[in-house]
């Protein structure tokens, strides 16, 4: 809500998971390993990489069944924290100048930071409109007090808030699971909100930081190949 | 509360066109995804699609060739146009309200309806 | 698509007895469940959503359980103003109705 069409291809680690429709995003972070959004969970995806208009083939497309989706053990539909998941490409992507990895934070997101959010995801605050082109917002990360504020009781230290606390611009339906970019590493998920694009409403993301172990752990031992030292 | 009509003709052609209208009354037709269900006499129930009012639309796959939905929000309603039926297309038609206007999550996903209309009977027939 | 397989098509019980109806997916559709009522001649009815969750206004002696793909509807004690067919539907990916449970009164 509230963005522009994104470059073509300029955001070359953003993916459409699709189950027969887009239903959630996701960030390439290797050649075989999608993160999402742990609600974005279903035990059949179809990773689209590469993609600008979901709805016309371009030429730059990867289309690669998921091998394995594995929701983070501590996931709470309820609450929503640990809203995270991880998808392993049942063959690696093709890396080149339209897909491509994004790095995993090396440190926690700090307060004013501008970030990237994109997403094929609805529009409209009041109503739905889904756009087939990519969507970029550029925002801000709001403080954990903002934040806290915003939703009282409802935000874990696993939470950040990104967007306006006078509303207008946000991530909404259909961009859960994609990424929130700063200075080139993903540092938040698309997760939720009350709403899309509310004053004193922002945009509730995962905290990639907190997850960069279990990210890693979880792909070594989903890998063919252990290395035992 | 909000309540649901729907209205078309009760009788139907083999091969023409089925359409059909749902008026939304008691609240506004903005805020939610709207359906259509049919239920043929005596069996069970098949989802036919959802609609935005944006006019974004989800159809079920076995009858997306045949099915259109659109929407009008000054009138508050929505509509069906099933093509090329059949007998088979006999059936209770029933246009409901999905059961959340869009959720806290940010995925897509289908929710079901917690309000519906009477239904009205289309019979296919020459 | 999904398909959803519902048991048994039809029950009989006496006033007070406990129901199960069973409902069982295709595939993994997580919590993704709803279960509806229906009487004769009327509109489906919601009475749980995602698999547990009990509709607003809707008597607490109905009840849902499940994930994946086993999910169980029950009513703890039934009343004769139950008497209905009910209907188990997957929201997990479009939209799919099981065939369908009708209760009766022995």
């Known amino acids: 809500v509230g963005g522009y069409i994104c470059e073509e291809n300029s955001v070359p680690y953003q993916v459409s998971l699709n189950s027969g429709y887009h239903f959630c995003g996701g960030s390439l972070i290797s050649e075989q390993w999608v993160v999402s959004a742990g609600h974005c969970y279903k035990s059949r995806i179809q990773v689209r990489l590469g993609e600008h208009n979901i709805e016309v083939l371009e030429g730059n497309e990867q289309f690669i069944n998921a091998a394995k989706i594995i929701r983070h053990p501590k996931y709470n539909s309820r609450t929503l924290d640990n809203d995270i998941l991880l998808i392993k490409l049942s063959s690696p992507a093709v890396i080149n100048s339209r897909v491509s990895a994004i790095s995993l934070p090396t440190a926690p997101p700090a307060a004013g930071t501008e970030s990237l959010i994109s997403g094929w995801g609805n529009t409209l605050s009041s109503g739905a409109d889904y756009p087939d082109e990519l969507q970029c917002l550029d925002a801000p990360v709001l403080s954990q007090a903002e934040c806290e504020a915003s939703y009282p009781g409802k935000i874990t230290n696993n939470m950040f808030c990104v967007g306006f606390l006078e509303g207008g611009k946000d991530s909404c339906q259909g961009d859960a699971g994609g990424p929130v970019v700063s200075n080139g590493e993903l540092q938040g998920i698309v997760s939720w909100g009350y709403g899309c694009a509310q004053k004193n409403r922002p945009g509730v993301y995962t905290k990639v930081y907190n997850y960069v172990d279990w990210i890693k752990d979880t792909i070594a031992a989903n890998s063919h190949h252990h290395h035992h030292h | 509360q909000v309540q649901l009509q729907e209205s078309g003709p009760g009788l139907v052609k083999p091969s023409e066109t089925l359409s059909l209208t749902c008026t939304v009354s008691?609240?506004?037709?903005?805020?939610?995804?709207w359906h259509w269900i049919r239920q043929p006499a005596g069996k069970g129930l098949e989802w036919i699609g959802r609609?935005?009012?944006?006019?974004?639309?989800y159809y079920n796959p076995s009858l997306k060739s045949r099915v259109t939905m659109s929407v009008d929000t000054s009138k508050n309603q929505f509509s069906l146009k099933l093509s090329s039926v059949t007998a088979a297309d006999t059936a209770v038609y029933y246009c409901?309200?999905?059961?959340?206007?869009?959720?806290?999550?940010?995925?897509?996903?289908?929710?079901?309806?917690?309000?519906w209309g009477q239904g009205t009977t289309v019979t296919v027939s020459s | 698509d999904i398909q959803m397989t519902q048991s048994p098509s039809s029950l009989s019980a006496s006033v007070g007895d406990r129901v199960t109806i069973t409902c069982q997916a295709s595939?993994?559709?997580?919590?993704?469940l709803n279960w509806y009522q229906q009487k004769p001649g009327k509109a489906p009815k919601l009475l749980i959503y995602?698999?547990?969750n009990l509709e607003t206004g809707v008597p607490s002696r109905f009840s849902g359980s499940g994930s994946g793909t086993d999910f169980t509807f029950t009513i703890s004690s039934l009343q004769p103003e139950d008497i209905a067919t009910y209907y188990c539907?997957?929201?997990?990916?479009?939209?799919?109705f099981g065939g369908g449970t009708k209760v009766e009164i022995k």
């Open positions: 409901a309200r999905d059961l959340t206007n869009y959720g806290i999550t940010k995925s897509i996903r289908f929710y079901g309806m917690d309000v």
């Open positions: 008691g609240g506004s037709i903005s805020s939610h995804y």
């Open positions: 609609i935005a009012t944006s006019g974004s639309t």
């Open positions: 595939q993994d559709i997580s919590n993704y």
């Open positions: 995602d698999a547990s």
């Open positions: 539907q997957q929201v997990d990916n479009f939209i799919t």
